[in-house]
Interface confidence: low
């Protein structure tokens, strides 16, 4: 008598979530009499998947009619597959008895469920940093299966190398998550820069999912300050200019002080953007020289993006200006914090 064989021809089957999976099983003989049952997993903790006698398996259907005479095909179809269905499925032959006795198992078919990763979400630092500082960006994607996944970081199209990536959990699971951190060194030119997290997975048919973050959310470019004096006008007024250049973000307050007293405060708004994404701003102050007996100390004070104020001061020499129209443009520059480096 030929020994009964339980044949599961496919070692593994891969199915997209939501699709149906067909698990094939045939037996080589009708003898001995007894049922076939399907289990997920092996050993004492295995899970019953299909048993013709019990009949309460709404998502599992036999491929061929198991009640028909001489049936040797015990393949099943599982509908509406979810990641929770992944595992190794065994077709098991039992000998009829009280109770039925397990006779032989197939080699098993591993069902891997392909589930797409969620759209990567990229988050940046909570506070802005200046050029030459390193900031971290995090990318997360969830819910994918199988576990194999690749994640790459790009800044302006160039792949980043200072990256740390983890896929969790480490062991077998119904689905997986990926979390990656990239460290980026900022430059003053990064206002228009972008970092991209790119996730590639078998379910995406070669089209990676991308999450992006703009470095404009992470960077602060401090302004340069320059104060200049124009030639004296006919009405004994001197035009003093404070040029605030190459700053980002736009949030900036400028205050003029005459001999330490606040003369005027202005807020930057609706400024045109430079090519590199930074802003420039020019403020003018008219000083009536004839109203002063002594030299006038002028200070241009700038508060940028909530940072400590930076000053640029110089003196207008009243003695250098006769009461009639003059043309002297020279001014003593007594600047403090002449370059705004913070």
């Amino acid at each position: 008598e030929e020994e009964l064989q339980v044949i599961q021809p496919e070692k593994s089957v891969s199915v997209a979530a939501g699709d149906s999976a067909t698990l094939n099983c045939t037996v080589s003989s009708l003898i001995p009499v007894g049922p076939i049952q399907w289990f997920r997993g092996a050993g004492p903790g295995r899970e019953l998947i299909y048993n013709l006698k019990e009949g309460h398996f709404p998502r599992v259907t036999p491929v061929s009619d198991p009640t028909k005479r001489n049936n040797m095909d015990f393949s099943i179809r599982i509908s509406n597959i979810t990641p929770a269905d992944a595992g190794t499925y065994y077709c098991v032959k039992f000998r009829k008895g009280s109770p039925d006795v397990e006779l032989k198992s197939g080699a098993g078919t591993e069902l891997s469920v392909r589930a797409k990763p969620s759209a990567p979400v990229v988050s940046g630092p909570a506070v802005r940093a200046t050029a030459e500082h390193t900031v971290s960006f995090t990318c997360e994607s969830h819910g994918f299966s199988p576990r194999d996944i690749t994640l790459k970081w790009f800044k302006n199209g160039n792949e980043l190398s200072d990256v740390q990536t983890n896929v969790d959990p480490a062991g077998k699971s119904v689905s997986y998550s990926i979390r990656s951190t990239a460290r980026v060194v900022l430059t003053r030119r990064d206002v228009h820069s972008q970092v991209i997290c790119e996730v590639a997975h078998v379910t995406l048919q070669g089209d990676p999912l991308r999450g992006t973050a703009n470095l404009s959310e992470a960077i602060r470019v401090p302004p340069f300050l320059e104060v200049t004096q124009q030639s004296m006008r006919a009405d004994n007024q001197v035009n003093v200019t404070c040029q605030v250049t190459k700053f980002y973000p736009q949030r900036l307050q400028l205050t003029w002080l005459e001999n330490g007293n606040v003369s005027r405060t202005e807020m930057a708004s609706a400024l045109p953007e430079n090519k590199d994404g930074t802003y420039n701003w020019t403020s003018w102050l008219l000083v009536n020289v004839s109203a002063h007996r002594d030299d006038v100390k002028l200070t241009c004070q700038v508060e940028h993006d909530g940072q400590p104020a930076v000053n640029k001061s110089f003196s207008v020499k009243v003695s250098a200006h006769p009461k009639e129209q003059g043309s002297n443009t020279a001014a003593e520059n007594t600047g403090t914090n002449e370059r705004n480096i913070y």
């Epitope: 939501g18 289990f39 295995r46 899970e47 299909y50 969620s118």
Partner: antibody, heavy 117, light 109 residues
């Protein structure tokens, strides 16, 4: 017939303990994820705990270590300690679907737990 | 745990009416949503799982839809035997936790 049946409910004083049991017929407890869902009088359903086919326990966040789920080859148990009045409810034993652990397709008739002094 | 918000909390409709119950998850649960029917004094009965799959033996007038955070249970033609409280239930496959909606009581006008 596939069914589950609860036992062990009763009246218990606040701070006391009670052990609920669930017996299965028509299938093996060791082959399925099993769980407990409760329903306070006149209220909605509330998930309590599940135990995987391999015996790993999972709890709702509000359980805070007061309940312990376990199972043998024949019964699934819920050990309830430090009981409070708000734990008064009908406790249902439920079996998760044969393939999808995302739903409960077999429910017992429930056992009533009353916590009162 | 994920918060499940069901609406309305109760409704009254006539026999033959189309009835819609919605359920909103506090975060995405993909399609891991089930619907249950509980008649007064009875045990909950599974109607729909995986958002839209009808459980065996459930009348085809019941249908489910939705994914992510927003889900709907529809009874295409309300019958007297449909008087019950309906619950949605989510499963979060990362935390492996379950959550039920607060229920919708359906009555006949």
């Amino acid at each position: 017939e596939v069914k589950v049946e609860e036992s062990g409910g009763g009246l218990v004083q606040p701070g006391g303990s009670l052990r609920l049991s669930c017996a299965a017929s028509g299938f093996s407890l060791s082959s399925y994820v099993m769980g407990w869902v409760r329903q306070a009088p006149g209220k909605g359903l509330e998930w309590v705990s599940i135990i995987s086919s391999s015996g790993s326990p999972y709890y709702a966040s509000w359980v805070n270590g007061r309940f312990t789920i376990s199972k043998t080859s024949t019964t699934m148990d819920l050990q309830m300690n430090s009981l409070r009045a708000e734990d008064t409810a009908v406790y249902y034993c439920a079996r998760v679907g044969p393939l999808g652990v995302d739903y409960f397709n077999i429910w017992g008739q429930g056992t009533t737990v009353t916590v009162s002094s | 745990d994920i918060q499940m918000t069901q609406s309305p909390s109760s409704l009254s409709a006539s026999v033959g009416d189309r009835v819609t119950i919605t359920c909103q998850a506090g975060q995405s649960i993909n399609s891991y949503l089930a619907w249950y029917q509980q008649k007064p004094g009875k045990v909950p009965k599974l109607l729909i799982y995986y958002a839209s799959t009808l459980e065996s033996g459930v009348p085809s007038r019941f249908s489910g839809s939705g994914s992510g955070t927003d889900f709907t249970l529809t009874i295409s033609s309300l019958q007297p035997e449909d008087v019950a409280t309906y619950y949605c239930q989510s499963w979060h496959y990362i935390s492996r936790s379950y959550a039920f909606g607060q229920g919708t009581k359906v009555e006949i006008k």
